[in-house]
């Protein structure tokens, strides 16, 4: 018996509008009902919860209306998506998946998506 | 699944000594990092000290009195607590997590990558 696994890409570039989207999916040893994913970022040796939410298997992802992420759940999938990166979150984001309900309990953790993000240079001001 | 159930606190003077022991079925420890936790009356739950295969990783206020160990071969870890002190009263909790490559000594114990957390056993330091 092993942990539970969850897999998520190993690198990601956010877009220039601070945006990075990236799948977790998990390998469900049982049928859960109650699932909560949580993300994580680690980052010079420092660990920050960046968001979370707990769904039931069927229904929408919701996260607290100031969260800096979105998401859509499909069968053992989550599409996760950051908004409002700038260069200074470049990291490790880590996928964190806990099947909550109906017992037993499981735990997984991804291996860490490496997001990158680079802020846009300034537009130059144009001279008329 | 993972189950964990901790045993071992109590009451003891300060200076005094008390073993946690924390005993897993349902699997095999090897693929986890234990760590123990701990939380008094109205602060956070903090890092006290975890073990994976190769690695121990201690909270500064208690390294040097504190010792964590394991024991694959029983499923169990064990957290000795030496020269007990008043702030060292509180709730203390077992939990696991799956050992991942990125953990560095600095980040493995983080409570937030834990779960299957015990219902914690109480631990009094007082004359």
């Known amino acids: 018996c092993k942990a539970m696994h969850v897999a998520q890409p190993a690198v990601v570039l956010a877009s220039s509008r601070g945006i990075a989207s990236f799948v977790c999916e998990y390998a469900s040893p049982g049928k859960a009902t109650e699932v909560r994913v949580t993300v994580l970022r680690q980052a010079d040796s420092q660990v920050t919860e960046v968001c979370a939410a707990t769904y039931m298997m069927g229904n929408e992802l919701t996260f607290l209306d100031d969260s800096i992420c979105t998401g859509t759940s499909s069968g053992n999938q989550v599409n996760l998506t950051i908004q409002g990166l700038r260069a200074m979150d470049t990291g490790l984001y880590i996928c964190k998946v806990e099947l909550m309900y109906p017992p037993p309990y499981y735990l997984g953790i991804g291996n860490g998506t490496q997001i990158y993000v680079i802020d846009p240079e300034p537009c130059p001001d144009s001279d008329f | 699944e993972v189950q964990l159930v901790e045993s071992g606190g109590g009451l003891v003077q300060p200076g005094g000594s008390l073993r946690l022991s924390c005993a897993a079925s349902g699997s095999t420890l090897d693929p986890f990092v234990i760590g123990w936790f701990r939380q008094a009356p109205g602060k956070e739950r903090e890092t006290v000290a975890c073990?994976?295969?190769?690695?121990?990783s201690y909270a500064d206020s208690v390294k040097g009195r504190f010792t964590i160990s394991r024991d694959n071969s029983k499923n169990m870890v064990y957290l000795q607590m030496n020269s007990l002190r008043a702030e060292d009263t509180a709730v203390y909790y077992c939990?696991?997590?799956?050992?991942?490559?990125?953990?560095?000594?600095?980040?493995?114990?983080?409570?937030?990558?834990?779960?299957?957390w015990t219902q914690g056993t109480q631990v009094t330091v007082s004359s």
């Open positions: 939990a696991a997590s799956p050992d991942k490559p990125f953990y560095t000594d600095q980040t493995m114990c983080n409570k937030h990558y834990y779960g299957y």
């Open positions: 073990i994976n295969r190769s690695r121990t």
